[in-house]
Every structure is written in C-alpha cells, then in structure tokens.
C-alpha cells in the first residue's frame, strides 16, 4: 500500500510540477519593469520568453513577440531550450509513468517492468526539474547581472540637461512558478525512484530442494527464473512482502473500476 | 456619442472644499480611466490625477495628495473630484478627461471644464 | 518630474504657410518595450476644453486633418502644419504621457500673420 501511495503521489506531484513547468514557460511576466520607488507607471513593461509586453495606464496591452532568432540573446536561447528539454522529458516521464502505475493494470505486465518504468519515469522527472530550475535560474542570474548594469548606468544624457531613464527589469512571477513547478517535479521524480525500490521483485532466497528422478540428481529453485526475471506470466510466483503477509495490492486481483486496459 | 458633462461654476472663500462632477455617457463607462486636469487662467495645463471607474482605484499627483478625492458613482456613471483646503491660487477651470484606451495614455474625450474661483 | 518646453511661445504664419512647434522632454518619452514614444498633442481653442490632435508623438487621431503631422523621437518632438488655415488658430500643448505626473508644455500660440 505505501509503494502504490508513494507511487501515486510521486505521479500527481510531478503532473502538478510539469503543467507549473509549461505554465511557465508560456507566461509573459519572465521580467517585469523594476518600479523602485514608484507602485503606479503609465507605462508598464514586462517580458516573457517568446515576447514582451507593454500594458498602459488605461489597461491597453501590447505584446511583440521575438521573430528573431538569430538576433536573441545566447542566453535566452539556452533558457528556452532548457525549459523546452524539460517540458519534453517530463511529457514522455508521465506518459511512461501512467502505465508504471501499479492500481493500472496493462494486461500481464510483471511488477518488475513497472518497477523499471517507474524508475524511468522518476528519472525523467528528476532531469526535467533541474531542466526547468536551471532555466529559471539561469534567466534570474541574467536579470540580476542587467539590473546592476542598468541601475550603474540610471542616467545617461548630455551634460545632465536630458536625461535617459534606462528600464530596469526585476524577477517576475514565471521565475517564482517555474522555481516551484522545477521544485515539485524534482520531488515527484525522487518519490517515484523510492516507489521502484519496493516495486522491484527480490530474489527470494529458499534453499534449494533436490528432487531425484530416474537416477539423476537435478536440483530446483522453485520459480527461480521467472520470478526474478519477470519474463512470462506466472501469477502463482507472485513476490511475497513482509515475511509472507500479502498487501493489499496483491489481494486485490479481481477487475476493478481502477483497473485500464 | 461620448459626452463629458461637468457640473456648473462654484465660488468658494478660502480654506472650503469644492465637488465637481463628471457624467460620462455614449460608453461602456468602466472601461476607460477618467483623469482630472486644471487649467489657471492663460496658463498651461496641470494633471491633477486620474480614477480608474472599475475599481475606484485613484491616482493623485504629490502637488495634490492630501488635498483632492477622486470617487465614482458606477450607477450613474459619474466620477467626482473635491479639492479642500482651497486656496486663490487654486481658481481655475477643472477639466475631466478620459484616458483614450490604446491611444499611449493620450486623453481622447475631454468635459467643457468647470470654472471654480476662489475669493474671499 | 519630466519637464516639457516649447518653443516658439508664440507663432505667427500666413494663411497656407507652414507652422513648425517644438516640443522637447528633460526625460526621454521612448519605449524600449513596444518602441514606442509617449507623447501626444493637443489643440486648444479660446474657450473651449483641448482637442487631441496625434498620439504616440506621429499618429493622427481620427477626424483630424492630414495637414497636422507629429514626428519626433526620444527627447524632441515637433508639430507641423504644413497648409495653415484660420480655424487652426489656437494654443498647441504637448504632453508627457510616459510617466507620472503628467506634465503638458507651456503651450505654443499659433496666429495668423
């Protein structure tokens, strides 16, 4: 039962952080005009990883997106491929995590190939979140390397008489959700690696019995190679946990609502 | 059509307050910003503020602050600016304008003013 | 706050002539964001509230004659009309629309010569 809840809540930790992942990535408020002193603009900008945005006092918005891709920063180019590797990793994570489930049942696939689903699964999870919290990171770093740059350069203008107010950009909500939905899958992913652990079917460890048979002495391992293996459908080689008490997962072998096919 | 109707001229003694209406119509009231601008006698203009009429939500000039209050009246599609405190230097004619909606924060439709003097 | 000067204060052209304003802002009113500029143009007759006339420093606004035409960029701006006529005798002001507070010019008295 605590692997199938470690398990489950490893997936919707992860489908959680993924969906925060592509929200992220999506969302235009990556940077947003720093305000310093002021809380209300007549012109207020803001920028996300495919565009940028001006909204004006009257609420009037105004996105641009970037059409360029060989004039965008190098920089930017490498956040978007991170959250994109990310998105992709953590899509192909819940898709092989989906059938990893073990309240889904998928003909008769042994709980050895759902161990290594979910291990797969976890893995991927993990690599997208440090995909999606690399990204952000690396765009936050950005922000504040141009932050000082601009805040060093406020004033430029001839003689002090015009006067060239430089927009200063600070961290917007994306970063915040993109840290989190990172955080959130990186977390899933460690939870579905703990929830292999104890999908994965041990080698039970019965001494060997010796059966002799018209003379010659063949010693047996009783479900020796399926059992560990996990090749073929040998129901009655079920793993035992705790010592011969059977959990509820394996009691429960009849069709239920929660069962796909 | 959009219309800006103000109310009539006020004579004030120093140190009273003065309420200047601003009836909006031929528009979906709440989707504009209203501003308030005077203009002193062959003098240039002065933004005193602006309300936005969706949400109530007001923003004054320093000059101003403390001293003006700009509210709405959603029902009749009216927004109000008081001056207190009034003072000569405040006579003037009080325009209400509203914010033209994608037109870079220019003021599009502006009331006939009304003349607010102050004397004692 | 962003200080607006005008120049000329006053204006006096013939009928048909070509009036030049000057409009220059202590702050630029370009927007790196949407590059654009924020500044617009009105038009104000004795007695009466101002006129739009050209927003975001370069676009007319509707029903306003081709003859008025903004242009500029940053920090200097000008209002040009290039066939005057005699209803077009007023005051112009330009206005900061970038930044709070507001802040509109002195005004330019255009007249007939």
């Known amino acids: 039962m605590a692997v199938t809840a470690c398990q489950g809540l490893g997936f919707v930790v992860s489908l959680i952080g993924i969906a925060g992942i592509i929200a992220a990535t999506c969302m235009d408020q990556w940077s947003t005009q720093d305000l310093y002193n002021n809380p209300v603009t007549a012109v207020f900008n803001y920028q996300g990883l495919w565009r940028s945005c001006v909204r004006e006092s009257s609420g009037f918005t105004e996105c641009r997106g970037y059409f360029t891709l060989l004039g965008l920063p190098a920089m930017l180019q490498a956040v978007r491929a991170l959250m994109i590797v990310g998105i992709v990793l953590g899509a192909i994570g819940l898709l092989v995590s989906i059938f990893a489930l073990k309240c889904i049942r998928i003909g008769s696939m042994e709980d050895s190939a759902k161990a290594n689903m979910t291990l797969t699964s976890g893995i991927m999870f993990i690599v997208s979140g440090l995909c999606a919290i690399a990204g952000v990171s690396v765009f936050a770093n950005m922000l504040v390397t141009n932050f000082w740059m601009s805040t060093a350069n406020m004033y430029t203008g001839m003689g002090g008489m015009v006067q060239t107010v430089q927009t200063r950009y600070t961290f917007g909500a994306a970063l915040f959700v993109g840290w989190v939905a990172g955080g959130l899958t990186l977390i899933g992913g460690v939870m579905m690696c703990i929830a292999c652990r104890g999908l994965a079917p041990e080698e039970t460890n019965y001494k060997a019995v010796s059966y002799h048979a018209s003379g010659h002495s063949v010693a047996y391992k009783p479900g020796g190679f399926k059992a560990s293996t996990g090749f073929g459908s040998n129901t009655k080689n079920k793993k035992i946990y705790d010592g011969g008490a059977r959990t509820e997962d394996e009691v429960q072998s009849y069709p239920s609502k929660h069962d796909y096919v | 059509q959009v219309q800006l109707v103000q109310s009539g001229a006020e004579v004030k003694k120093p140190g009273a307050s003065v309420k200047v209406s601003c009836k909006a119509s031929?528009?979906?009231?709440?989707?504009?910003?209203m501003l308030w601008v005077r203009q002193a006698h062959g003098q240039s203009l002065e933004w005193m503020g602006n309300?936005?009429?969706?949400?109530?939500?007001?923003y004054y000039a320093l000059k101003f602050q403390g001293r003006v209050t700009m509210t709405v009246d959603r029902s009749t599609s009216t927004v109000y600016m008081e001056l207190s405190s009034l003072r000569s230097e405040d006579t003037a004619v009080y325009y209400c304008?509203?914010?033209?909606?994608?037109?870079?924060?220019?003021?599009?439709?502006w009331g006939q003013g009304t003349l607010v003097t102050v004397s004692s | 706050d962003i200080v607006m000067t005008q120049s000329p204060y006053s204006l006096a052209v013939s009928l048909g002539e070509r009036a030049t304003i000057n409009c220059k802002s202590s702050?630029?009113?370009?927007?790196?964001?949407?590059?654009?500029?924020?500044l617009a143009w009105y038009q104000q007759k004795p007695g009466q509230p101002p006129k739009l006339l050209i927003y975001?420093?370069?676009t007319r606004e509707s029903g306003v004659p081709d003859r008025f035409t903004g242009s500029g960029s940053g920090t200097d701006f000008t209002l040009t009309i290039s066939s005057l006529q005699a209803e077009d005798v007023a005051v112009y002001y330009c206005?900061?629309?970038?930044?709070?507070?507001?802040?509109f010019g002195q005004g330019t008295k255009v007249e007939i010569k």
């Open positions: 304008a509203r914010d033209g909606y994608s037109l870079r924060n220019a003021m599009d439709y």
């Open positions: 031929g528009y979906t009231f709440t989707d504009y910003l």
């Open positions: 309300i936005n009429p969706y949400y109530g939500r007001t």
């Open positions: 702050q630029s009113l370009f927007n790196s964001g949407n590059q654009k500029n924020y």
């Open positions: 975001g420093a370069s």
């Open positions: 206005q900061n629309a970038h930044s709070y507070p507001y802040t």
